[in-house]
């Protein structure tokens, strides 16, 4: 999906009001020094591409993020504020139902959510290169 035509400001508002708080709840008890951000993004569409990938695609050691509250709210925000996003997700959702696993918070998941916080931070404030 090409995130170029999303309403970035509306997504940002949704992130600040709810999604960010759910991410903090998920990470509660984790030291702020524990994880270094290794995934980066260069502009808002790129950030949303990386956010979608880390939130919804199962990875080795962390297969369960898609059912978390922050993930459901992320999906809703993208569906509302990115034209045509919902249609592209129907097949992905059906595939997800088939491979649903028991919800377990692993250290790998905590690291992944820490990366998500970093991606959202850069989505909110892409550091523009000096002219």
């Amino acid at each position: 999906y090409d995130f170029t035509n999303c309403d970035f400001e509306k997504i940002k508002a949704a992130y600040l009001s709810t999604i960010s708080k759910d991410l903090i709840t998920y990470m509660s008890g984790t030291k702020s020094t524990e994880f270094n951000n290794t995934v980066s993004c260069s502009n808002r569409p790129h950030c949303l591409t990386e956010i979608q990938s880390l939130t919804f695609n199962p990875t080795a050691g962390c297969a369960s993020l898609a059912k978390e509250m922050f993930a459901m709210k992320t999906k809703a925000a993208l569906a509302i504020w990115c034209p045509g996003y919902s249609e592209t997700q129907i097949n992905a959702t059906q595939a997800m139902k088939k491979r649903r696993k028991r919800k377990v918070t692993t250290n790998k998941c905590l690291e992944q959510v820490s990366q998500l916080q970093g991606l959202w931070r850069r989505f909110n404030r892409p550091l523009l290169k000096q002219q």
Partner: antibody, heavy 119, light 107 residues
């Protein structure tokens, strides 16, 4: 807990340079942008520039471009602000600040470094 | 660059009063606005981010509203520790700029 500790007060002559340090602790230094803000006596806050400690990317306010240099030392979790060709109008308190978890504000500030420029 | 204008520049009020400070942006900044409180000789402290979100640990008597170019900070019932200078700042794009400040004094 998160802390930004700045270097001590400086007295400089016009035309000289100053380098202020900002040592960060209590968080992953390279994950967050560091910004520099100054405040002249009795005046408001003035944004100077920003650095990404991970990449070294910087952005300076037009007013300071060519005179200010922001750097970061990942090994010591320290950010630096160097201001050259000092003039009396540069007398101010200089603050470093860390962006928040959401990137929508500054949530922690240094205690400030007072710079006096006088002949 | 985006200019931020605050009004009033100073304000006298009494403990228990409801106070409103306004910040105007020279162009649309959506909800990308922050409010800080600063006391003499101290660094600013974050009150509100994203125009309306209360920073953790900040008393609920502080609230923010507005979007686009017009924003307000409201203190519902002034407490003695609220007498300070308040600044808005846009977080829309680089370069960031601060408002001119509002000094809140005891009447």
């Amino acid at each position: 807990q998160v802390q930004l500790v700045q270097s001590g007060a400086e007295v400089k002559k016009p035309g000289a340079s100053v380098k202020v340090s900002c040592k960060a602790s209590g968080y992953a230094f390279t994950n967050y942008l560091i910004e520099w803000v100054r405040q002249a006596p009795g005046q408001g806050l003035e944004w100077m520039g920003i650095i990404n400690p991970e990449s070294g990317d910087t952005y300076y306010a037009q007013k300071f471009q060519g005179r200010v240099t922001l750097t970061a030392d990942k090994s010591t979790s320290t950010a630096y602000m160097e201001l050259s060709s000092l003039r009396s109008e540069d007398s101010a308190v200089y603050y470093c600040a860390k962006e928040s978890l959401t990137g929508s504000s500054y949530d922690y500030w240094g205690q400030g470094t007072t710079l006096t420029v006088s002949s | 660059d985006i200019q931020m204008t605050q009004s009033p520049s100073s304000l006298s009020a009494s403990v228990g009063d409801r106070v409103t400070i306004t910040c105007r942006a020279s162009e649309n900044i959506y909800s990308n606005l922050v409010w800080y409180q600063q006391k003499p000789g101290k660094a600013p402290q974050l009150l509100i981010y994203g125009a309306r979100n209360l920073q953790s640990g900040v008393p609920s008597r502080f609230s923010g509203s507005g979007s686009g170019t017009q924003f307000t900070l409201t203190i519902s019932s002034l407490q003695p520790e609220d007498f300070a200078t308040y600044y808005c700042q846009h977080f829309y794009e680089t370069p960031l700029t601060f408002g001119t400040g509002t000094k809140l004094e005891i009447k």
